[in-house]
Amino acid sequence: IVGGTNSSWGEWPWQVSLQVKLTAQRHLCGGSLIGHQWVLTAAHCFDGLPLQDVWRIYSGILNLSDITKDTPFSQIKEIIIHQNYKVSEGNHDIALIKLQAPLNYTEFQKPICLPSKGDTSTIYTNCWVTGWGFSKEKGEIQNILQKVNIPLVTNEECQKRYQDYKITQRMVCAGYKEGGKDACKGDSGGPLVCKHNGMWRLVGITSWGEGCARREQPGVYTKVAEYMDWILEKTQSSDGKAQMQSPA
């Protein structure tokens, strides 16, 4: 996160850290807890690393430096990448992770509510992006979970800024015209959440941007509302019943 500040314990209890353990262990992506056994993240996090066994999912944590060999983590039972995601393009950057064992909810580890299907009418004015990603383009992973308040940008405006790419209706953009605040490398897959009528909702999944926090280069996020049918289909077919935090 560029231009952010430290988060507090329990402030973003749905935020998870997706880490890979090969020879060393490192944080690669963020994710959002959406049910006892489900995490929503970006498909591109698994490019070149599709093996379930190498991943460790840490929930209910604030500081990555607090993680030791004794820190509990979740393992992956199944990675479900959107069927239309292609490595050669930036569309449908969404994936579900089914955990091997369900998580208990606590003050520091609980799910984020999902938006209504095709939610286009709600005007979100209080949106935040969180993650342990770089604090500048040529930076490094941060220890303490960062947060930043960023306004949404219309798709029309976003398309003007990204003429080389197709900004689809299944994407949502956020950023300041002057730059300075944005997601960055390592924040991929994490949440863009907006508070509406007193409730936090998962509006976007951190996907991509041209550099980080550059002027007139908003961040681009997968629009969760556009994938509600897919999310429900995959979680229900796997569970027999939905275990999601549906919107109030």
């Epitope: 490019d47 050669s88 930036g90 950057d93 003429q163 790419y165 991509w208």
Partner: antibody, heavy 125, light 108 residues
Framework: EVQLLESGGGLVQPGGSLRLSCAAS????????MTWVRQAPGKGLEWVSY????????IYADSVKGRFTISRDNSKNTLYLQMNSLRAEDTAVYYC??????????????????WGQGTLVTVSS | DIQMTQSPGTLSLSPGERATLSCRTS???????LAWYQQTPGQAPRLLIY???SRATGIPDRFSGTGYGTDFTLTISRLEPEDYGTYYC?????????FGQGTRVEIK
């Protein structure tokens, strides 16, 4: 299966014009940047031009700027290269290529993942 | 413009040998925008490596790419008969997009 098929090459006199076409199939053409690359006989590859998915943004190599025009018709899944004021040094095999723009670590990538078979343009009197 | 300088110009090696091809750039190139292509006579180029180190679909694991900034390398761990040809590095970090002049890998 992704396919790119160039056509329109041939022999043309210096100062003449030619229009190359590239018919695309097997993918959502309107989502991709497209590019032209050329290769003079016995020489290396030279990038010529690219066009954005909508067609609203185009960039050219200095060697062809003001003479060549790249365009596309997304309804026909076709890429074009209009070549005017041709010179002997424009003699080359012209390839159209798809520009993949995937996502790696929250940034986009760019690389030419699919190529046509090429069409030969010969500029000679 | 970003100049791409490949070395050596020609590499004469026997099957089974290791090939190391270098690509140096005149300015910093974001690794995401560095690719390697193979071309055999009479054929269109074929993508081998993108993002400096990711193998394209269907490319055998004897091909690997490394590098950062201005110094990139393509390695073929054990040359196979079908690997002979010309290899090009290319950047699309800044326009104009540019190719190296190529390294020809020939049978010794």
């Amino acid at each position: 299966e992704v396919q790119l098929l160039e056509s329109g090459g041939g022999l043309v006199q210096p100062g003449g014009s030619l229009r190359l076409s590239c018919a695309a199939s097997g993918f959502t053409f309107s989502h991709y940047l497209m590019t032209w690359v050329r290769q003079a006989p016995g020489k290396g590859l030279e990038w010529v031009s690219y066009i954005s998915p909508s067609g609203g943004h185009t960039i050219y190599a200095d060697s062809v700027k003001g003479r060549f025009t790249i365009s596309r018709d997304n309804s026909k899944n076709t890429l074009y290269l209009q070549m005017n004021s041709l010179r002997a040094e424009d003699t080359a095999v012209y390839y159209c290529a798809r520009v993949a723009t995937g996502i790696v670590a929250r940034s986009r990538t760019r690389y030419f993942d699919q190529w046509g078979q090429g069409t030969l343009v010969t500029v000679s009197s | 413009d970003i100049q791409m300088t490949q070395s050596p110009g020609t590499l004469s090696l026997s099957p089974g040998e290791r090939a190391t091809l270098s690509c140096r750039t005149s300015q910093f190139v974001n690794s995401n925008y560095l690719a390697w292509y193979q071309q055999t006579p009479g054929q269109a180029p074929r993508l081998l490596i993108y993002g400096a180190s990711s193998r394209a679909t269907g490319i055998p694991d004897r091909f690997s790419g490394t590098g950062y900034g201005t110094d990139f390398t393509l390695t073929i761990s054990r040359l196979e008969p079908e690997d002979y040809g010309t290899y090009y590095c290319q950047q699309s970090s800044r326009t104009p997009w540019t190719f190296g002049q190529g390294t020809r890998v020939e049978i010794k």
